[in-house]
């Protein structure tokens, strides 16, 4: 029930924690499962047990195998198993899948990459970071405590990140590397009932007869990429294309904008050479998505020409 996979590279330090928990005061006995041989606690040994931790300083390929830990509490003993695999160092840059820790995802607002397993080691800064084997340089990358922060994350930042640090044990230093994949995702989006920003409900728009007029229908639908969201104009409850007045046209395509991070759409209605009969029409701005439809109505009124007195 309590088995945990651990892996490392030959000639690096590897520290494994017993999968069964216990208080620091509880004795933990470690055994090499295949031989049932007890792991020594003396630190002079290359492989030794230290409470809940099993230390390989450094690890060798021959150390691979299953190790048993027994936590001896005042009530019952509790047993865990550590399945340890030590691999030979790769000569090329590629990190094979079996050496990869869990993938983490980041976004523009949250781009922390934690160095896996580092909390088990006695390390001191600096922590070195590499992406696809290249040392990370530049002001966008900041190594902070046990994690890497990337400023202004872009999709190109996705890849395999390796942290490298030094473990110190009784004055001796051992190298440790750990690699994990980083993926870049869009910020979590959401959709909501359309909110029409313009025009206002029952707005009266002043126009000049004989001049051109533009009406803008603008609505927001949520955050992130939206599916099945649209804005459009209707004349007297009829689609513009079906109304049959060539002077009145919707602007081709819908302009997408992001206002305060919200996904919004605009549709402009263009009226050429405004006529008296246009003032009698009802102009409806419609915004619709999966949540439903919202309608704001606009009417046109004649703009009185300004009298110029001498």
């Amino acid at each position: 029930k309590f088995s945990k996979q651990s892996w490392g590279l030959e000639n690096e330090a590897l520290i494994v924690r017993c999968p069964r928990q216990g208080k620091p005061s509880y004795t933990v006995d470690w055994y090499y499962s295949q031989t049932n041989k007890s792991i020594p606690t003396q630190e002079r040994n290359r492989v030794f047990a230290s409470g809940q931790l099993l230390k390989f300083l450094p690890a060798a390929v021959a150390d691979s195998g299953i190790y048993t830990c027994i936590v001896r509490s005042p009530t019952f003993n509790r047993t865990g198993y550590a399945n340890v695999t030590i691999y030979k160092k790769q000569s090329d840059c590629n990190v094979p899948d079996y050496l990869m820790y869990s993938t983490v995802s980041g976004s523009e607002k949250n781009s922390k990459i934690y160095c896996p397993t580092i909390d088990l080691y006695n390390w001191t800064a600096p922590l070195e970071w590499f992406k696809n084997c290249q040392a990370l340089q530049g002001s966008r990358y900041r190594a902070h405590k046990s994690f890497l922060v990337i400023d202004n994350v872009m999709t190109e930042d996705a890849g395999d990140y390796t942290c490298k640090f030094i473990h110190n044990e009784n004055g001796a230093n051992y190298s440790v590397t750990a690699t994990r994949s980083f993926t870049v995702k869009d910020e979590q989006g959401f959709s909501l009932f359309p909110v029409i920003g313009a025009p206002a409900q029952n707005e009266i728009k002043e126009v000049e007869i004989g001049k051109n007029a533009n009406l803008t229908c603008s609505a927001c639908f949520g955050k992130g990429t939206q599916f099945l969201a649209a804005v459009l104009w209707q004349l007297n409850g009829t689609k513009i294309t079906d109304f049959g007045e060539p002077r009145i046209q919707q602007e081709e395509g819908q302009n997408q904008s992001f206002s305060n991070g919200l996904a919004c759409l605009d549709m402009v209605l263009r009226i050429a050479d405004v006529k008296e009969e246009d003032l009698l029409l009802q102009y409806d701005c419609l915004a619709l998505n999966l949540h439903g439809l919202r309608r704001h109505t606009v009417r046109l009124s004649r703009k009185n020409p300004i009298d110029h007195h001498s």
Epitope: K1, R20, Q21, G22, K23, I70, S73, P74, T75, F76, N77, R78, T79
Partner: antibody
């Protein structure tokens, strides 16, 4: 199938003695601690004590120490809970439960169906 | 003895609701805490051991968390068959002790 089967309901008078049983099957009886839990009418669960049938090692809750005896017969894979002199306050449901091995433990994972003990004059 | 304080003592929730029960130990018990379900007239049944591990065969809507002195048991989406009393139990020290129980009913 791993199971614990308890003896049937008992009705006794105050001062009488009683021994109830719990038979284990489907697992290595001597390798697991087995214990007893009391539940008085309408109340919660109270841990009484355990025995390791492999060597008859026992542990008791101070509340039940000296009040009851826990024993086991590994030849017939059965654990026992007994009273030498029952009291009305012993009226309860008694459950036996398996408590893990000498080297591993993860809760009271197998329970008997319970034995109702009624003590009334 | 380690005292285990469970709350609430009873609750009523609708089918599909998220239900949370807390258990507090009078001293540090690491993660040595189990959760049991007892249906009326039945023996208790182990649901969660070592604070957060789901016992084999137990539906994934049940979960547990916590360490030290504060623990939480959650039913993510209450089902009619979850009507029962739930108990926490520590096994860090003898005597093993149970919480007082939480009776869960359907509204």
């Amino acid at each position: 199938e791993v199971q614990l089967v308890q003896s049937g309901a008992e009705v006794k008078k105050p001062g009488e003695s009683l021994k109830i049983s719990c038979k284990g099957s489907g697992y290595s009886f001597t390798n697991y601690w087995i214990g007893w839990v009391r539940q008085m009418p309408g109340k919660g669960l109270e841990w009484m004590g355990i025995i390791y049938p492999g060597n008859s090692d026992t542990r008791f809750s101070p509340s039940f120490q000296g009040q009851v005896t826990i024993s086991a017969d590994k030849s017939i894979t059965t654990a026992y809970l007994q009273w030498s002199s029952l009291k009305a306050s012993d009226t309860a449901m008694y459950y036996c439960a398996r408590h893990g091995t000498s080297s591993d433990y993860y809760g009271l994972d197998v329970w008997g169906q319970g034995t109702t003990v009624t003590v009334s004059s | 003895d380690i005292q285990m304080t469970q709350s609430p003592s009873s609750l009523s929730a609708s089918v599909g609701d998220r239900v949370t029960i807390t258990c507090q130990a009078s001293q540090d018990i690491s993660n040595y805490l189990n959760w049991y379900q007892q249906k009326p007239g039945k023996a208790p049944k182990l649901l969660i051991y070592d604070a957060s591990n789901l016992e084999t065969g137990v539906p994934s809507r049940f979960s547990g968390s916590g360490s030290g002195t504060d623990f939480t048991f959650t039913i993510s989406s209450l089902q009619p068959e979850d009507i029962a009393t739930y108990y926490c139990q520590q096994d860090d020290n003898f005597p093993l002790t149970f919480g007082g129980g939480t009776k869960v009913e359907i509204k």
